[in-house]
C-alpha cells in the first residue's frame, strides 16, 4: 500500500510539474523590464517570453506581439523554446509509460514488467525535469549577469519573471515526482515471496496481489 501511495504521490507531483512547465513555457514573463521614462505617464512594463513580448502601460492596457521570424530570433531563445517543448513531450511520454506500468492498470500483467515500466517512467520524468531546468537557469543566469554588468544600460537590464519561478517549480516537481516513482521499485519489483509464487502460477496477478491492491474504482 505504501508503494502504491508513493506512486500516486509521484505521478500527482509530475502532473503538477507538467502543468507548471506548460504555463511557464507559454507565459511571456521570462524577463521583466520596468521602464520609467522622464514622465511617470510613460511608465511601462515589458514582459518578454519565448513566443511573444508584451508591453503593459501604466494605464493597465496591454499589447502583445508574437515574434515574427524564427530565424531572426537569438540562438539562446530558439534553444530555450526547443528545450521547453522537448521537456513537455518527454514528460508526456513518461506519463504514458507510467500508465502502462501503474499498479491500477492492466496494460501489462507481469509484476516485474510493471515495476520496470514505473521505474522507466520515473527516470523519464527526471530527464524532463532536467530539460525544464536548463532554459530556466540559462535565462536567469543571463539576467543576473546583465544586472551586474556595469556596461549594460539600465534600460536594457531585466528582472526575473514569474515564468522562471514557475519553471523552477515545474522542474522541482518533475524531479521529485520522478524520484518518488524510481523509489517505489528499488530492485525492479523482484522482492519477497510473491515474485517466486508468480513464476509458477498460471494466473500470476490473482496469487501475487491481494485484492486490497486492486480497488475496483481504480481499474483502467
Amino acid at each position: 500500500m505504501a508503494s502504491a501511495g508513493m506512486q500516486i504521490l509521484g505521478v500527482v507531483l509530475t502532473l503538477l510539474g507538467w502543468v507548471n512547465g506548460l504555463v511557464s513555457c507559454a507565459l511571456p514573463m521570462w524577463k521583466v523590464t520596468a521602464f520609467i521614462g522622464n514622465s511617470i505617464v510613460v511608465a511601462q512594463v515589458v514582459w518578454e517570453g519565448l513566443w511573444m513580448s508584451c508591453v503593459v502601460q501604466s494605464t493597465g492596457q496591454m499589447q502583445c506581439k508574437v515574434y515574427d521570424s524564427l530565424l531572426a530570433l537569438p540562438q539562446d531563445l530558439q534553444a530555450a523554446r526547443a528545450l521547453c517543448v522537448i521537456a513537455l513531450l518527454v514528460a508526456l511520454f513518461g506519463l504514458l509509460v507510467y500508465l502502462a506500468g501503474a499498479k491500477c492498470t492492466t496494460c501489462v500483467e507481469e509484476k516485474d514488467s510493471k515495476a520496470r515500466l514505473v521505474l522507466t517512467s520515473g527516470i523519464v520524468f527526471v530527464i524532463s525535469g532536467v530539460l525544464t531546468l536548463i532554459p530556466v537557469c540559462w535565462t536567469a543566469h543571463a539576467i543576473i549577469r546583465d544586472f551586474y554588468n556595469p556596461l549594460v544600460a539600465e534600460a536594457q537590464k531585466r528582472e526575473l519573471g514569474a515564468s522562471l519561478y514557475l519553471g523552477w517549480a515545474a522542474s522541482g516537481l518533475l524531479l521529485l515526482g520522478g524520484g518518488l516513482l524510481c523509489c517505489t521499485c528499488p530492485s525492479g519489483g523482484s522482492q519477497g515471496p510473491s515474485h517466486y509464487m508468480a513464476r509458477y502460477s498460471t494466473s500470476a496477478p490473482a496469487i501475487s496481489r491481494g485484492p486490497s491492491e486492486y480497488p475496483t474504482k481504480n481499474y483502467v
Epitope: 537569438p74 539562446d76 543571463a142 554588468n149 556595469p150 556596461l151 549594460v152 544600460a153 539600465e154 536594457q156
Partner: antibody, heavy 119, light 107 residues
Framework: EVKLVESGGGLVKPGGSLRLSCAAS????????MSWVRQTPAKRLEWVVT????????YYPDSVKGRFTISRDNARNTLYLQMSSLRAEDTAVYYC????????????WGQGTLVTVSS | DIQMTQSPSSLSASVGDRVTITCRAS??????LAWYQQKPGKSPQLLVY???LLVDGVPSRFSGSRSGTQFSLTISSLQPEDVARYYC?????????FGSGTKLEIK
C-alpha cells in the same frame, strides 16, 4: 549638454604617480556609471576602470589592478583616477566616459588628457 | 581574456560605396558588442550597441549585424564625413576589450 573635462595629465617618470580628474556637468552625475579608457600612441583603445553610480562597486582589468584606483565625489560632480607605479606602457590619452540609461557601452567621452611616462 | 580581431586594419573606398568592417570574438560574447567611430582629432563616439542597435542620431546608413562570434558594421553608402577610425568592443565579461581599429579613408 553632457560635458566631461579631464585634467591632471602630464609627463611622469616610470614608477611615479599621477592623479587625473574629470569634471562633469550637464547631467545628474550620481545617476551614472563612469569609466576611464585610454588610447595608446599606436591608436589602440584599452579599458582602464569602471565605477558604479554610487561608487560602491569598481571594476579593473588585471593590467592596472593594484596600481590604479578610481573614485568619485558625487557632491563635487568629479571623477578621479589615482595612478601609481606608472610604466612606459601606461603612456596614453586618458578619456573620462559616462554610461547611459538607454545605451550599452561607453556612451559619452571627454576630450582626453595625455599622460606620458618616460625617463 | 576575450580577444577581438578586427579587419581590415585600413580601408579605402569611394563615396557611395558599401563598406563592411568585421570583428571576430575569440569566444562567445552573445550580442554584447559595441561599435565606435573616432573622427580625426576627436574623441571616440558610440555608434552601435548590443551588436545591432543604433544610437539616436546615428545615420541609418550605418548598421550592425551578428553571425555567431563574427560581427559586422556596414555603411550602405559611404559619405565623406564617415572618414574615421572604427573600433569594436565587447562587454560580455571583464576585461572589456577593443578591436585594433579600422582606418577608413575616401579614395
Amino acid at each position: 549638454e553632457v560635458k566631461l573635462v579631464e585634467s591632471g595629465g602630464g609627463l611622469v617618470k616610470p614608477g611615479g604617480s599621477l592623479r587625473l580628474s574629470c569634471a562633469a556637468s550637464g547631467f545628474t552625475f550620481n545617476s551614472y556609471t563612469m569609466s576611464w579608457v585610454r588610447q595608446t600612441p599606436a591608436k589602440r583603445l584599452e579599458w582602464v576602470v569602471t565605477i558604479s553610480s554610487g561608487g560602491g562597486r569598481t571594476y579593473y582589468p588585471d593590467s592596472v589592478k593594484g596600481r590604479f584606483t578610481i573614485s568619485r565625489d558625487n557632491a563635487r560632480n568629479t571623477l578621479y583616477l589615482q595612478m601609481s607605479s606608472l610604466r612606459a606602457e601606461d603612456t596614453a590619452v586618458y578619456y573620462c566616459i559616462r554610461g547611459d540609461y538607454r545605451y550599452d557601452g561607453f556612451a559619452y567621452w571627454g576630450q582626453g588628457t595625455l599622460v606620458t611616462v618616460s625617463s | 581574456d576575450i580577444q577581438m580581431t578586427q579587419s581590415p586594419s585600413s580601408l579605402s573606398a569611394s563615396v557611395g560605396d558599401r563598406v563592411t568592417i568585421t570583428c571576430r570574438a575569440s569566444e562567445n560574447i552573445d550580442s554584447y558588442l559595441a561599435w565606435y567611430q573616432q573622427k580625426p582629432g576627436k574623441s571616440p563616439q558610440l555608434l552601435v550597441y548590443a551588436s545591432t542597435l543604433l544610437v539616436d542620431g546615428v545615420p541609418s546608413r550605418f548598421s550592425g549585424s551578428r553571425s555567431g562570434t563574427q560581427f559586422s558594421l556596414t555603411i550602405s553608402s559611404l559619405q565623406p564625413e564617415d572618414v574615421a577610425r572604427y573600433y569594436c568592443q565587447h562587454y560580455y565579461s571583464i576585461p572589456y576589450t577593443f578591436g585594433s581599429g579600422t582606418k577608413l579613408e575616401i579614395k
